[in-house]
Interface confidence: low
């Protein structure tokens, strides 16, 4: 069983490496756009057990203008250069299957994703009206501040809902 071609997302492209069941692919925002905070670029080929038909999950991805380019004056056509967009490796959470929102990077700086430090998991408190999620941080080598190892840290949403792309603890993106 395989999935059909995935849906299109405005201002984004996807290069599918595998259409097989349970494969995960990532949309990449086009040059000049970046992923909106709180949206997920991940899609997964899943099986609808009722119909036995495979389909791609709907990504919550929203690509918005790159803030660095919003106020820049366009260069003459002969001198325009576009930074290549490359997928960024995923940061992993301790367990589970759901994707946590992550992103490609379209910076010119060398961006890397640091692995989780074993044993650094925080135990967040959970209240009925507050969604709590444990989030792994990404790191980037960009001068100051210094490059360090990422560690899990707890963020608590003060809103009564979680933004799209933020998933409850115990879920992770394992790609």
């Amino acid at each position: 069983i395989t999935c059909p071609p995935p849906m299109s997302v405005e201002h984004a492209d996807i290069w599918v490496k595998s259409y097989s069941l349970y494969s995960r692919e990532r949309y990449i925002c086009n040059s000049g756009f970046k992923r909106k905070a709180g949206t997920s670029s991940l899609t997964e080929c899943v099986l609808n057990k009722a119909t036995n038909v495979a389909h791609w999950t709907t990504p919550s991805l929203k690509c918005i203008r790159d803030p660095a380019l919003v106020h820049q004056r366009p260069a003459p056509p002969s001198t325009v250069t576009t930074a290549g967009v490359t997928p960024q490796p995923e940061s992993l959470s301790p367990s589970g299957k759901e994707p946590a929102a992550s992103s490609p990077s379209s910076n010119n700086t060398a961006a890397t994703t640091a692995a989780i430090v074993p044993g650094s998991q925080l135990m967040p408190s959970k209240s009925p009206s507050t969604g709590t999620t444990e989030i792994s941080s990404h790191e980037s080598s960009h001068g100051t501040p210094s490059q360090t190892t990422a560690k899990n840290w707890e963020l608590t949403a003060s809103a009564s809902h979680q933004p799209p792309g933020v998933y409850p603890q115990g879920h992770s993106d394992t790609t």
Epitope: A37, T39, I64, A111, H138, P163, V166
Partner: nanobody, 124 residues
């Protein structure tokens, strides 16, 4: 040009308060999430707080929850971090950054913009 300029740091006694400010320019403020990170000498960079302007959601690291409050003034393109009940371990350089609240891209990755930092020193 994207610019983030922090201010408001200083020396304060344990239990005291400070209010950090971040003046943002060069991008459409309410399209992005902005937050605060800190780094103490010889320690790992640590996320402090984040605000997703799309829906007003705010996030806090467990170590500062209940003591720190993030807020913004979209009209002025300003983000604030009110820090109460400060502890010696809060001593660090605090950076304002465009980031992603969902995965917390610490000063890099998706959005690679941050300020020059402001020093906060809490004495006992």
């Amino acid at each position: 040009e994207v610019q983030l300029v922090e201010s408001g740091g200083g020396l304060v006694q344990a239990g005291g308060s400070l209010r950090l400010s971040c003046a943002a320019s060069g991008f459409t403020f309410d399209d992005y999430a902005i937050g605060w990170f800190r780094q103490a000498p010889g320690k790992e960079r640590e996320g402090v707080s984040c605000m997703d302007s799309s829906d007003g959601s705010t996030y806090y690291a467990g170590s500062v929850k209940g003591r720190f409050t993030i807020s913004s003034d979209n009209a002025k393109n300003m983000v604030y971090l009110q820090m109460n009940s400060l502890k010696v371990e809060d001593t660090a350089v605090y950076y304002c950054a465009i980031l992603d609240c969902a995965v917390v891209t610490t000063l890099g990755g998706e959005y690679d913009y941050w300020g020059q930092g402001t020093q906060v020193t809490v004495s006992s």
